[in-house]
Interface confidence: medium
């Protein structure tokens, strides 16, 4: 069976004009998934991103996340790329800043 992920992008305020953008994928199966941030269509280097592991969400499906830190005002240049079971999509940063606990 294949259950496509639900993808959600959020922003959190951090200091000095930077924000942390987090892309969360949830409720997907099977477990193998691509999730990465892209700037102007190009994947960011590995060491500028932080990933959570792919973990069960309690419903027989899985969840994970990827986060990166960007300059506030440049949100429109960044997209979260998702690939799962042959399907793929890009998800933009909304620009709406939420006050969330950072992963960093």
């Amino acid at each position: 069976r294949t259950v496509p992920p639900m993808v959600n992008v959020t922003c959190s305020e951090v200091s000095e004009g930077n924000i942390t953008v987090t892309c969360r994928a949830s409720s997907f199966y099977p477990r193998n998934i691509t999730l990465t941030w892209r700037q102007d269509g190009v994947s960011l280097s590995h060491n500028t991103q932080q990933w959570g592991d792919v973990l069960p969400d309690g419903n027989g499906t899985y969840q994970t996340w990827v986060a990166t830190r960007i300059r506030q005002g440049e949100e429109q240049r960044f997209t979260c790329y998702m690939e799962h079971s042959g399907n793929h999509g890009t998800h933009p940063v909304s620009g709406k800043v939420l006050v969330l606990q950072s992963h960093w």
């Epitope: 477990r31 990465t36 590995h46 990933w51 592991d53 973990l55 790329y81 690939e83 042959g86």
Partner: antibody, heavy 119, light 108 residues
């Protein structure tokens, strides 16, 4: 720095079981999964299975009936046990860290445990 | 399972030469999940190129990778002595995850 150090027997009798311990340092088993891969002259590199951070396991169907992978997060140890070994199980067994990120490549390898199945 | 066929099995090259080895998959593999490893005799494999074209840390820029679908390649633009090794392609696209049989790159 990231290290995976393996210990285990070099010689196993046919039909007996193999146990290898992989002790990791420089990272936590609560944040990285670990694969087991073996290498033999006849079959090359073969993926055996892996254990995720939450302790769940994925196995190569060819080995699922005689392979188990476990871990002890507090001791930073991962364990491989394979039953009913035969001569064609001879090879080098590696524990390997599952890289994070969009590629999930095997980014750090242990030094390998050379296993000979022979009477 | 996905079979990865590497060719040639042995590749002899002169120092300074440009060389390319290929990896052909029996069914389509996402470029995100196609990786290359380098192994020298007596040592463990090392991650060399990940996701088709990204060089792992410390890998010289003379290495490059490319491809999509069922056809992938690794190229050395300017062969050096330290590049002599066996290179394996690997797919993490579908379980069981598989490796190619390797291309041994040697100095002519």
């Amino acid at each position: 720095q990231v290290q995976l150090k393996q210990s285990g027997p070099g010689l196993v009798q046919p039909s007996q079981s193999l146990s290898i311990t992989c002790i990791v340092s420089g990272f936590s088993l609560t944040t990285y999964g670990v694969h087991w891969v073996r290498q033999s002259p006849g079959k090359g590199l073969e993926w055996l299975g892996m254990i995720w951070t939450d302790g769940t396991t994925d196995y190569n169907a060819a080995f699922i009936s005689r392979l188990s992978i476990n871990k002890d997060n507090s001791k930073s140890q991962v364990f491989l046990k394979m039953n009913s070994l035969q001569a064609d199980d001879t090879g080098i067994y590696y524990c390997v860290r599952k890289g994070h990120g969009y590629y999930y490549a095997m980014d750090y390898w242990g030094q390998g445990t050379s296993v000979t199945v022979s009477s | 399972q996905i079979l990865l066929t590497q060719s040639p099995a042995i590749l002899s090259a002169s120092l300074g030469e440009r060389v390319t080895m290929t990896c052909t998959a029996s069914s389509s593999v996402s470029s995100s999940y196609l990786h290359w490893y380098q192994q020298k005799p007596g040592s463990s494999p090392k991650l060399w190129i990940y996701s088709t074209s990204n060089l792992a840390s410390g890998v010289p820029a003379r290495f490059s990778g490319g491809g999509s679908g069922t056809s992938y390649s690794l190229t050395v633009s300017n062969m050096e002595a330290e590049d002599a090794a066996t290179y394996y392609c690997h797919q993490y696209h579908r379980s069981p995850f598989t490796f190619g049989s390797g291309t041994k790159l040697e100095i002519k």
